[in-house]
Interface confidence: low
């Protein structure tokens, strides 16, 4: 994906079919890459991130990932192609409307990664258990 | 109920400026892109910009590219689009619009606003 | 820009007849097209999206097919209330241009 900064024109209005035939839009995410984040010990945390970007190809979805090691918590904010990997791990939520945080292993950090299919999905970041993707009334969600 | 009230039309004369409004209600308005869309008297439909839910991204045609700003206030769930450098091919009716998440209705426009006129004219 | 060509331009008919509308884009849109309602005085409907997707809400004697370039818009039998301007869409690539529209008149 091209970053913000440098992002060509891209068509806002182009759609593509997954598996399902589901028709998808380019996706509007968050996209601030790697920043440094105050979100500890919450249920939820705003991405705090100003920049919206459409995703370079209309199959990326957002990703948002959370890491916390002994000197500091980072929050990262990107599209990103749900058919390959992202961190070394597959994007197994990328057709959830929410950005569900998962613990992922990975060592000397705690490290958190959720993706989601909906507009700016990873401007917020749902670590609380109430939400858990095996909840069949999670994909009903159509944010109304 | 999803509701779309525009405001802020009327006369104006060329060169002049107008701040159209868009009051909504009946779903959550900060993550829902919208657009606005005009039409000319006795014409068709014609996309004039996007904006995105969180306000960051926008896109414009090329006919109002640099002379109309479109905006957002989610804390009061209202869509703005500011018109400069008026011009009478500018006369139409704006429609405030909502763009639908992808995996509901692909982004196409599911909810319209009743409109409001615009006459550019000397 | 991608042109969207609507034919015919109006057709008159009448209730319980089987209406058929054409749009052609002037390039490949693949499946991406909507087709709106619009009444005099008030604004668009949805009522078909992705080509042949029908908008909640909407009676099942619309229907759309088509891909590529060229897309149907039926109506198996026509109501009172159908009696309407219609516009089909494209929404391949930005800028989303319209159709110049199709008015259903009442014979």
């Known amino acids: 994906t091209i970053p913000p900064h440098v992002q060509k024109s891209v068509n806002n209005d182009m759609i593509v079919t997954d598996n399902n035939g589901a028709v998808k839009f380019p996706q509007l995410c968050k996209f601030c890459d790697v920043r440094f984040s105050t979100c500890d010990n919450q249920k939820s945390c705003m991405s705090n991130c100003s920049i919206t970007s459409i995703c370079e190809k209309p199959q990326e979805v957002c990703v948002a990932v959370w890491r916390k090691n002994d000197e500091n918590i980072t929050l990262e904010t990107v599209c990103h192609d749900p058919k390959l990997p992202y961190h070394d791990f597959i994007l197994e939520d990328a057709a959830s409307p929410k950005c569900i945080m998962k613990e992922k292993k990975k060592p000397g950090e705690t490290f958190f990664m959720c993706s989601c299919s909906s507009d700016e999905c990873n401007d917020n970041i749902i670590f609380s258990e109430e939400y858990n993707t095996s909840n069949p009334d999670l994909l009903l969600v159509i944010f109304q | 109920e999803v509701q779309l009230v525009e405001s802020g039309g009327g006369l104006v004369q060329p060169g002049g400026s107008l701040r159209l409004s868009c009051a909504a209600s009946?779903?959550?308005?900060?993550?829902?892109?919208m657009t606005w869309v005009r039409q000319a008297p006795g014409k068709g439909l014609e996309w004039v910009s996007v904006?995105?839910?969180?306000?960051?991204?926008?896109y414009y045609a090329d006919s109002v590219k640099g002379r109309f700003t479109i905006s957002r206030d989610n804390s009061k769930n209202t869509l703005y689009l500011q018109m400069n450098s008026l011009r009478a091919e500018d006369t139409a009716v704006y429609y405030c619009?909502?763009?639908?998440?992808?995996?509901?209705?692909?982004?196409?426009?599911?909810?319209w606003g009743q409109g409001t006129l615009v006459t550019v004219s000397s | 820009d991608i042109q969207m060509t609507q034919s015919p331009s109006s057709l008159s008919a009448s209730v319980g007849d089987r209406v058929t509308i054409t749009c052609r884009a002037s390039?490949?849109?693949?499946?991406?097209l909507n087709w709106y309602q619009q009444k005099p005085g008030k604004a668009p409907k949805l009522l078909i999206y992705?080509?042949?997707s029908l908008q909640s809400g909407v009676p099942s004697r619309f229907s759309g097919s088509g891909s590529g370039t060229d897309f149907t818009l039926t109506i198996s039998s026509l109501q009172p209330e159908d009696f309407a301007t219609y516009y089909c869409?494209?929404?391949?690539?930005?800028?989303?241009?319209f159709g110049q529209g199709t008015k259903v008149e009442i014979k």
């Open positions: 619009a909502r763009r639908g998440q992808y995996r509901d209705i692909v982004g196409a426009t599911d909810y």
């Open positions: 904006i995105s839910g969180s306000g960051g991204t926008t």
């Open positions: 009946g779903f959550r308005f900060d993550i829902y892109a």
């Open positions: 390039q490949s849109i693949s499946s991406y």
């Open positions: 869409q494209q929404s391949y690539s930005t800028p989303p241009t």
């Open positions: 992705a080509a042949s």
